[in-house]
């Protein structure tokens, strides 16, 4: 391993998964590295092998148990180390005392569906996946709608500052194809970030009734 610029970032999905990304400029693609997890108040230790995701970036998932099991709490600390093989020994490349609930990134929302669609309006609902019951209602959402001829990056963000797993989109154009995405973020945690965007939900507004004023 080379002493290039390095970055080690991990997030907890609030249930049973810690996902980590390790990047290092100038490191060889076939460098063998792993993440080792050593909790302060649990009996288990965990290791995952870092696998290449790009030229100088590796990722792995520490799977702590069944997807919906609550494996860590707000008082847990897990010491995470990146270990890379150098000849016959392992070298510590990065280390952090990881506080799971300060470093949250939830799974993308799932089960998006059109509840009701009209000519100018569409009501959409979704569900959150593998989210801790500890949050109660302390979650927020961002949503975006892709209009014809535009990109996702151009789509304005709609912010829902509470745990509201539905939205009513208004001022839509009749008989038009749209796509919709949503993401979620807990309010807790200094380093907490948005979940990935959900899979896009495609829908079409109803055509305007013939002879009616629209």
């Amino acid at each position: 391993a080379v002493n290039g610029t390095s970055q080690f970032t991990c997030f907890y999905n609030s249930r049973a998964n810690i996902s980590c990304v390790w990047s290092q400029d100038g490191a060889l693609q076939d460098t063998s590295c792993q993440v080792h997890a050593w909790p302060d108040r649990r009996r288990w230790n965990q290791t995952c092998e870092l696998l290449p995701v790009s030229q100088a970036s590796w990722a792995c998932n520490l799977i702590l148990g069944a997807p919906d099991s609550q494996k860590l709490t707000t008082v847990d600390i897990v010491t995470l180390r990146v270990l890379c093989r150098e000849g016959v020994r392992w070298r510590v490349m990065a280390i952090q005392d990881f506080k799971p609930f300060e470093n949250l990134r939830l799974m993308a929302p799932i089960s998006l569906q059109v509840v009701h669609v009209e000519t100018h309006r569409c009501n959409i609902s979704w569900e959150i996946s593998q989210a801790s019951h500890y949050f109660e209602r302390h979650l927020e959402f961002e949503a975006r709608t892709l209009s014809p001829g535009h990109t996702w990056e151009e789509a304005p963000l709609l912010t829902l500052k509470q745990k509201q797993e539905w939205i009513c989109l208004e001022t839509l154009t009749p008989d038009t194809q749209y796509e919709f995405q949503v993401r979620v973020k807990p309010l807790q945690g200094e380093f907490t970030t948005w979940s990935p965007w959900s899979q896009p939900l495609a829908f079409r507004t109803k055509p305007a009734a013939l002879g009616k004023d629209t």
């Epitope: 002493n3 050593w38 600390i77 010491t79 990065a94 952090q96 506080k99 300060e102």
Partner: nanobody
Framework: QVQLVESGGGLVQPGESLGLSCAAS????????MSWVRQAPGKGLEWVSS????????DYADSVKGRFTISRDNAKNTLYLQMNSLKPEDTAVYYC???????????????????RGQGTQVTVSS
């Protein structure tokens, strides 16, 4: 705003001990790795020791290993450096430094610090 205030420096004889403290404020102390660095007269900045946010991981420069101990009290937002068996070559201004995240990188331990205190002078002389 982030503040780091070192104290405990002074003049000691070779072989004696000294304890440095660093009082931190303006950030969630326990979320960040911290380090001690030093600068001898006419020299560049030299890394001394690092510690993870909860104090579960520590690391030392070869020149101080076995003589210096880094620790922290997160309830008091304070970082410590206990220096034993001091040598004339330990003479320097000692700074406490905050890393920009919870992570530090042992192969490049000075990289990634974003704040440093004003420093406290340690002089080892007979």
């Amino acid at each position: 705003q982030v503040q780091l205030v070192e104290s405990g420096g002074g003049l000691v004889q070779p072989g004696e001990s000294l304890g440095l403290s660093c009082a931190a404020s303006g950030f969630t102390f326990s979320n960040y790795a911290m380090s001690w660095v030093r600068q001898a007269p006419g020299k560049g900045l030299e890394w001394v020791s690092s510690i993870t946010g909860a104090g579960r991981g520590t690391d030392y420069a070869d020149s101080v290993k076995g003589r210096f101990t880094i620790s922290r009290d997160n309830a008091k937002n304070t970082l410590y450096l206990q220096m034993n068996s001091l040598k004339p070559e330990d003479t320097a201004v000692y700074y406490c430094a905050k890393y920009s995240s919870g992570t530090y990188y042992p192969p490049t331990p000075v990289r990634g610090t974003d704040y440093r205190g004003q420093g406290t002078q340690v002089t080892v002389s007979s």
